[in-house]
């Protein structure tokens, strides 16, 4: 099967890597614009070159390309706890991250919000705090996980989710005769 | 058993409002964040808002900031969505959906959604 191409890539094709073919005449192939440039005016005719100007600040484009305008670059979404990993330049789009012992838990595609790596009090790391995963905690006897923090089973009422995880210390507090049963 | 009951959808104007509601069980409500997803007719889910625990921390997409309101009652058990301002982009099903932190996007569990209409 051919893959559906749309009438931009359609027309990319017929000229050879690196070249466009000129909206206006399609017997001519300009070369592309290289990456951190835009095109500004479109090759005159064959083997001349393509105007390509540089972006502006604010702009960039990441890859060889024949956009009419650069893109503008990303800012960093402090309200989501983000932080600025790298500026933008004219052929990089800002990145943005999260803080030392924070990862991302992604609401879209696109958009990310940083949380505070648990700690682990009160257990153990099972897996460390990852860029996208919270630590896994693994917690002591006693304590129970609720929302990946380690819990005291004091807290823990009838019927919630954690009598099941509490249930042995439960049965502890009975009395040793119980402790050999099955 | 957890189980999740949306509750308020219907037929609005443009420009109208809507109260959200959805009714949670089975589960421990207070430990979770909890949150609204929905889905338009052709479309993928899409996280619309969430809300920690506590209700202190609160997330809202940029398309519905400044018109949607999300809040919670614990000792209901209870989650709610005000929605303001309806545009006919708002049409979708609603869901109400435990937030699973980390990774994403993932759409936690959820109920059997509430269906929310905007046309004049």
């Known amino acids: 099967l051919v893959p559906h191409l749309g009438d931009r890539e359609k027309r990319d094709s017929v000229c050879p890597q690196g070249k466009y073919i000129h909206p206006q005449n399609n017997s001519i192939c300009c070369t592309k614009c290289h990456k951190g440039t835009y095109l500004y005016n479109d090759c005159p005719g064959p083997g001349q070159d393509t105007d390509c100007r540089e972006c502006e600040s604010g702009s960039f484009t990441a890859s060889e390309n024949h956009l009419r305008h650069c893109l503008s670059c990303s800012k960093c979404r402090k309200e989501m706890g983000q932080v600025e990993i790298s500026s933008c330049t004219v052929d990089r789009d800002t990145v943005c991250g999260c803080r030392k012992n924070q990862y991302r838990h992604y609401w879209s595609e696109n958009l990310f919000q940083c949380f505070n790596c648990s700690l682990c009090l009160n257990g153990t790391v099972h897996l460390s705090c990852q860029e996208k995963q919270n630590t896994v905690c693994t917690c002591h006897a006693g304590f129970f996980l609720r929302e990946n923090e380690c819990v005291s089973c004091s807290n823990c009422k009838k019927s919630l989710e954690c009598t099941k995880l509490c249930l042995p210390q439960i049965e502890n507090v009975k009395g040793t005769e119980d402790s050999g049963t099955t | 058993e957890v189980q999740l009951l949306e509750s308020g959808g219907g037929l609005v104007q443009p420009g109208g409002s809507l109260r959200l509601s959805c009714a949670a069980s089975?589960?421990?409500?207070?430990?979770?964040?909890m949150g609204w997803v929905r889905q338009a007719p052709g479309k993928g889910l899409e996280w619309v808002s969430a809300?920690?625990?506590?209700?202190?921390?609160?997330y809202y997409a940029d398309s519905v900031k400044g018109r949607f309101t999300i809040s919670r009652d614990n000792s209901k058990s209870t989650l709610y969505l005000q929605m303001n301002s309806l545009r006919a982009e708002d049409a979708a099903v609603y869901y109400c959906?435990?937030?699973?932190?980390?990774?994403?996007?993932?759409?936690?569990?959820r109920g059997q959604g509430t269906l929310v209409t905007v046309s004049s």
């Open positions: 959906a435990k937030v699973k932190l980390g990774g994403g996007p993932n759409f936690g569990y």
């Open positions: 089975g589960f421990t409500f207070e430990w979770y964040w």
């Open positions: 809300i920690s625990g506590s209700g202190g921390s609160t």
